[in-house]
């Protein structure tokens, strides 16, 4: 089965006496190892005696190898898949067919590859694009169908003879495929490479020179031109004539057209190499140029700059900036079209002329009020003076100056009126447009800067107003002093510190938070009666009696305001006990008869305790003691006590009558 | 080890016939190619006819063709050589051989290359 047997190496292999040949090999025997290797040279089959005629160049059998040229031929591969080759050297002779007889366990093969060695190196190739073209990047490939790793060689890259600058990449390539040496060498031609001769040599590991391939490089590029002028300066008065010639000094492809541009614009009926200009104008100031084009492009010639004399143009004046803010800087600018240019320059403000001044700027560095106006200026050059122009305005702005707040009322101002401001100032630029108001309220403007404040409030302290253009100019605030009565009037306990107990020596305080004018009179009130005319209520030692609701007023002269009722709350222990009965102190006995402890306490009893006639206290803690039925032993005098969380008290004793029913008498 | 017997030669008149058979013994490739050679004495060794196991090819040289034929059992592992209208030149020791194919970029030999394996030979001689 032939398709067992896959091989892969070069068709071909190129070599040159004394260099060396590798051969690149792969194989795959599918029915197993590598018994045996021959390598013919020249192998020639022979029909009659069914053996191959040729030199045996390599013997390797299972019996082992058998030297012939064994140094010189190497098998470098193996019993299954490496088929490589190495003759070192090689000889002129050893071109043709080198024959790879192949035995495995089942088969035999011959595998052919063709040897060229030629007597002396063979030169590289070198290829070109299809079309280089000036400027634009190109690869130089110089390719030579050779590499062996036994024999080190280098390409070299000249241009006219000498090694070219440029960093060359080579590559080597020694694989089943291919086997080749290639040196990459990216190069940008210029015009003047056009015709060059590029040349890549091949030389030895040590520079010795082999081989080599050149060309002639064939550089596209527009028209190369160079441009003369008569005068050659290019500087000439009006009226006079100027000639123009353009000449190619190179083109590849020839030319095709010629033309003259000024300022990059074609100039038309302009189509030889000579442009002649006759009693020429200023208006014929300008770069000239000449272009010629071919199939590439279009070429231009370096730009010649005619300048054609003439005095100075009425001028005009450019103001950087106008209008301009107050402060900051400003520059005027002279424009007068001249040629040459200007050399003194005169300025004018309001046509009154500018001493020292003449420059083609002036530069102010602070712009006041007073520098607004009319500038205008004459230019100066050699051919003689300009006329004055219609000159620029500058308006200088700033923002209103001497702003003041102004209160229109008598004073003083009492709480409640009606007030109005009115915002003043002395100069504006532009226009003021607008007022503004600290602070901000809900208040009316009837007009523009004036402000109206209806039922003025006791805190309106100041006032301040700005006047607005581009910028707002902001007045001193104005006080506005308004008058009131006192405020926050409020009763404050200064001592004890803790609650009020009968006994207590006590003081109040008439508290207010404000009062304008601050001097103040104190009234001290309980039940609509005056109890004094000091800030302060003083009690050496308070009893119940004193307790209740009380006011203090503080008056100015613009009114009086009253405090809340403060409640004063005095404390003390249960007293005037007393114990009353019900139905009466008399009862009879069966039925119902009610004890009630009553007392006067602050805070009200909390533990009521019975005592009877042997002062023995009884099983009972609430106010009202109850005996039902009541018997004719509970016969006695009573007593109660009372405690809360000041102290207790007691009740003097009250005598309770238990007597006989009738049932009771009629039966004894 | 691969073992070749020959058999079937002897004297013959000019214009006879004879038939030899080898018979390979040691040889275990399905697929092989068997031939016969001659040796007269002070000649090379020359093919007289081959066959292949696997297709039936035959090979026969120009100076045998139309005379003689060869003819194969491969499961005997056994070739024939029937030898009609025999010439004095015919006279030499005929050999068998057996090989493995013998592959030349694709394309076979019918013939053994190089004799791979071949038997003691068997002697044709032809006179009258």
């Known amino acids: 089965d032939s398709s067992k047997w896959v091989f892969e190496h070069p068709e071909t292999l190129y070599a040159w006496e004394g260099a060396c040949v590798w051969i690149p090999c792969t194989y795959r025997a599918l029915d197993g190892d590598l018994e045996s290797f021959i390598l013919f040279h020249n192998p020639e089959y022979n029909k009659n005696t069914s053996k191959f005629d040729g030199t045996r160049l390599y013997e390797s059998t299972k019996d082992g190898k058998v030297p012939s040229e064994q140094k010189r031929v190497q098998f470098l591969g193996d019993k299954n898949k490496n088929c490589t080759l190495s003759i070192h050297p090689v000889h002129l002779n050893d071109s043709g067919q080198l024959g790879l007889r192949m035995e495995s366990k089942t088969e035999k093969w011959m595998e052919r590859i063709h040897l060229n060695v030629s007597e002396r190196p063979f030169p590289p190739h070198i290829q070109l694009p299809p079309e280089i073209q000036e400027s634009q990047e190109v690869t130089l490939t110089c390719l030579l169908n050779f590499s062996c790793y036994g024999y080190p060689i280098q390409l070299q890259w000249l241009l006219e003879g000498v090694p070219m600058r440029q960093a060359a990449v080579t590559s080597t390539s020694l694989t089943i495929k291919s086997v080749f040496t290639r040196s990459e060498l990216k190069f940008s031609p210029q015009w003047s490479h056009h015709g060059k001769i590029v040349t890549c040599q091949l030389q030895d590991a040590d520079g010795k020179f082999l081989s080599n391939d050149t060309v002639q490089l064939n550089v596209k590029h527009t028209p190369k031109l160079e441009i003369k002028v008569t005068p050659s300066d290019a500087i000439v008065r009006e009226g006079d004539s100027v000639t123009m010639t353009c000449e190619v000094s190179s083109s590849n492809p020839e030319y095709t057209t010629v033309s003259w541009l000024k300022d990059g614009t074609s100039l038309k009926k302009q189509n030889t190499f000579t442009l002649n200009l006759r009693e020429v104008t200023k208006d014929q100031s300008g770069k000239y140029c000449c272009q010629v084009s071919n199939d590439v492009g279009p070429g231009r010639s370096e730009e010649v700059f005619l300048q054609v004399q003439y005095a100075p143009e009425p001028s005009t004046v450019q103001i950087l900036h106008s209008p301009a803010v107050e402060g900051s800087q400003v520059e005027f600018l002279c424009m007068s079209l001249a040629n040459p240019l200007p050399t003194n320059y005169t300025w004018y403000h309001n046509g009154k002329e500018m001493q020292g001044r003449t420059e083609e700027k002036v530069h102010i560095p602070k712009i006041l009020p007073w520098h607004a106006g009319t500038y205008s200026c004459v230019a100066e050059n050699i051919l003689g003076t300009g006329q004055r122009g219609p000159g620029a305005e500058l308006d200088v702005q700033y923002p209103p100056k001497k702003v003041t707040t102004v209160i229109q009322n008598p004073m003083p101002i009492r709480e409640g009126d009606t007030v109005t401001l009115s915002c003043n100032y002395n100069s504006s630029n532009p226009s003021v447009t607008r007022y503004e108001w600290k602070p901000h309220g809900a208040w009316e403007e009837p007009s523009l800067g004036v402000l109206k404040i209806q039922n003025v409030g006791w805190d309106n302290t100041t006032i301040a107003c700005a006047a607005c253009n581009s910028w707002c100019s902001w007045a001193s605030p104005v006080a506005l002093n308004v008058q009131y009565a006192p405020r926050d009037v409020r009763v404050r306990k200064i001592k004890p510190l803790s609650e009020i107990h009968s006994g207590n020596s006590v003081s109040l305080q008439c508290d207010f938070s404000s009062s304008h004018p601050k001097e103040v009179q104190f009234f001290w009130e309980k039940n609509g009666r005056l109890l004094g005319k000091e800030s302060q209520l003083n009690f050496d030692s308070i009893s119940p009696e004193d307790a209740g609701s009380y006011s203090c007023w503080v008056n100015n002269s613009i009114g009086q305001t009253a405090s809340k009722a403060w409640t004063l709350e005095v404390l003390y222990a249960p007293r005037r006990l007393r114990v009353s009965m019900s139905p009466g102190d008399q009862v009879m006995e069966g039925k119902s008869a009610t004890l009630t402890c009553e007392s006067d306490a602050n805070p009200p009893v909390s533990h009521y305790t019975w005592f009877d006639w042997n002062n023995q206290s009884l099983p009972y803690h609430s106010q009202k003691l109850r005996l039902e039925p009541v018997k004719v032993q509970h016969s006695g005098a009573y007593w109660c006590q009372g405690t809360n969380s000041v102290g207790k008290g007691r009740s003097p004793l009250s005598t309770l009558t238990v007597y006989y029913s009738p049932e009771t008498i009629g039966r004894r | 080890q691969v073992q070749l017997v020959e058999s079937g030669g002897g004297l013959v008149q000019p214009g006879g016939s004879l038939r030899l058979s080898c018979t390979v013994s040691?040889?275990?490739?399905?697929?092989?190619?068997m031939g016969w050679f001659r040796q007269a004495p002070g000649k090379e060794r020359e093919v007289v006819s081959c066959i292949s196991s696997s297709d039936g090819a035959t090979y026969y040289p120009d100076s045998v063709k139309g005379r003689f034929t060869i003819s194969r059992d491969n499961a005997k592992k056994t070739v024939y050589l029937q030898m009609n209208a025999l010439k004095p030149e015919d006279t030499a020791i005929y050999y068998c051989?057996?090989?493995?194919?013998?592959?030349?970029?694709?394309?076979?030999?019918?013939?053994?290359?190089?004799?791979?394996?071949w038997g003691q030979g068997t002697q044709v001689t032809v006179s009258s």
């Open positions: 040691g040889f275990s490739l399905d697929y092989y190619v």
């Open positions: 051989a057996v090989d493995k194919p013998f592959y030349d970029g694709g394309s076979y030999y019918t013939c053994p290359v190089d004799f791979g394996s």
